[in-house]
């Protein structure tokens, strides 16, 4: 398998967080140090991910802090693994008409989901909201990802690589940050704009119409803000 350790690849973009979203809440997919995968209502150091795109719409998803790949077993359970298995740790990425993204195992066909149900992906299906994801640029200060052991002497380059195995804390030549539309700043609760008084789009309704089509800013973040 070419490039059997995608962690070493140079085509990783910036840190992002994958989150499910309804009109009322959002859960960020996080990969814990012990390999457990769940959702958190907010960005955490364990929900900071790197997503590497491969040929034919395949992606490899890695938790930066856990140093684990997102993988799936034959029952559809998702987990984080230090070992990269091409069959279990690559996912087919597809963008739905509503602008949300789904990820499914080409091997087992199950959807990546923060819900407990294991459902196979079928073309044209409308998956439940906890199986549909949006991406958001990391907002956690990078210092939180970098907790070196205190040393008396100046650290060497080798020490740096141990602390930052994915090389995400230093600028790199081939960074491909998320589109600006995905990381736009939104009004705060103190703003007097209509969006701020209805920050979750409650007045305008719920999930984006699955037949509305279109991507761009609306496809990237269909709702004004999630709590």
């Amino acid at each position: 398998y070419p490039n059997a350790s995608p962690l070493l690849g140079s085509s990783w973009g910036g840190l992002i967080h994958l989150y499910t979203a309804t009109a009322r809440n959002s859960y960020h997919l996080q990969i814990h140090k012990n390999g457990h995968v769940d959702g958190a209502p907010h960005q955490t150091i364990y929900s900071a991910l790197m997503i590497r795109s491969e040929d034919a719409g395949f992606v490899v998803i890695t938790g930066v802090m856990s140093r684990r790949y997102l993988c799936m077993d034959f029952r559809g359970n998702i987990f984080g693994s230090h070992y990269f298995d091409p069959e279990n740790c690559r996912f087919q990425h597809q963008t739905l008409e509503n602008g949300y993204d789904v990820y499914h195992s080409p091997q087992y066909h199950f959807l990546v989901s923060l819900g407990r149900a294991k459902r196979a992906f079928l073309p044209g299906m409308n998956p439940p909201p906890y199986s549909q994801f949006l991406s958001r640029r990391n907002e956690i200060p990078l210092i939180h990802f970098n907790t070196p052991i205190p040393r008396r002497h100046t650290q060497s380059a080798e020490d740096d690589s141990e602390r930052d195995p994915l090389n995400v804390l230093k600028p790199r030549a081939r960074m491909t940050p998320a589109p600006a539309s995905c990381s736009q700043e939104l009004p705060s609760a103190e703003d007097n704009s209509p969006m701020a008084s209805d920050p979750l789009g409650v007045v305008r309704g719920g999930r984006v119409n699955t037949h509305a089509g279109g991507t761009g800013p609306e496809g990237c973040r269909p709702f004004a803000k999630f709590i």
């Epitope: 958190a40 819900g115 149900a117 299906m125 439940p128």
Partner: antibody, heavy 117, light 106 residues
Framework: QVQLVQSGAEVKKPGASVKVSCKAS????????MHWVRQAPGQGLEWMGI????????SNAQKFQGRVTMTRDTSTSTVYMELSSLRSEDTAVYYC??????????WGQGTMVTVSS | AIQLTQSPSSLSASVGDRVTITCRAS??????LVWYQQKPGKAPKLLIY???YLESGVPSRFSGSGSGTDFTLTISSLQPEDFATYYC????????FGPGTKVDIK
Amino acid sequence: QVQLVQSGAEVKKPGASVKVSCKASGYTFTNHYMHWVRQAPGQGLEWMGIINPISGSTSNAQKFQGRVTMTRDTSTSTVYMELSSLRSEDTAVYYCARDIVDAFDFWGQGTMVTVSS
Amino acid sequence: AIQLTQSPSSLSASVGDRVTITCRASQGISSALVWYQQKPGKAPKLLIYDASYLESGVPSRFSGSGSGTDFTLTISSLQPEDFATYYCQQFNDYFTFGPGTKVDIK
């Protein structure tokens, strides 16, 4: 084990406010949204609102906009729901419930609020 | 917002009966539907999530089915402890509940 323990029954006069508490234990408080649901006597369940336990951000059902305030205290793993300008039709049992992405898996025991002059 | 309707609103049945309750959504909600059981004076109890998945600890006589707009809760053989009110709830956009179905003794 997960537990949501709510404050005791309240009797209030019309126009007053009531504040109900819900203390969580047995799990990481900041990892789950909390909801408030109420049930008038002999009636069905009515969703009131949701609070993000780490940011304190809230979203309420339109029916309660401006009357309900949800807060949380992370140091005690407690969420609060305050309902103001009470009227007789607010007489109900008020529940807190934990969100686990695809369901409300644990509920408080309920707090009976009676609004009567 | 999505509305949920349940039918019937109440039903009388005997122990051992097969009971079916339906929940209809005003628009498609995929499989994002939950069923709860509530007994008088008690908080609701989760039975089924994601339309058809049995919550841990719930007896296998309970089952759920459906997707999109039409959903069903079935109790294959009604037991004395099953007399209660059953609610559906959708998780697709807000968190709307159905009006409930009361199952009582015939």
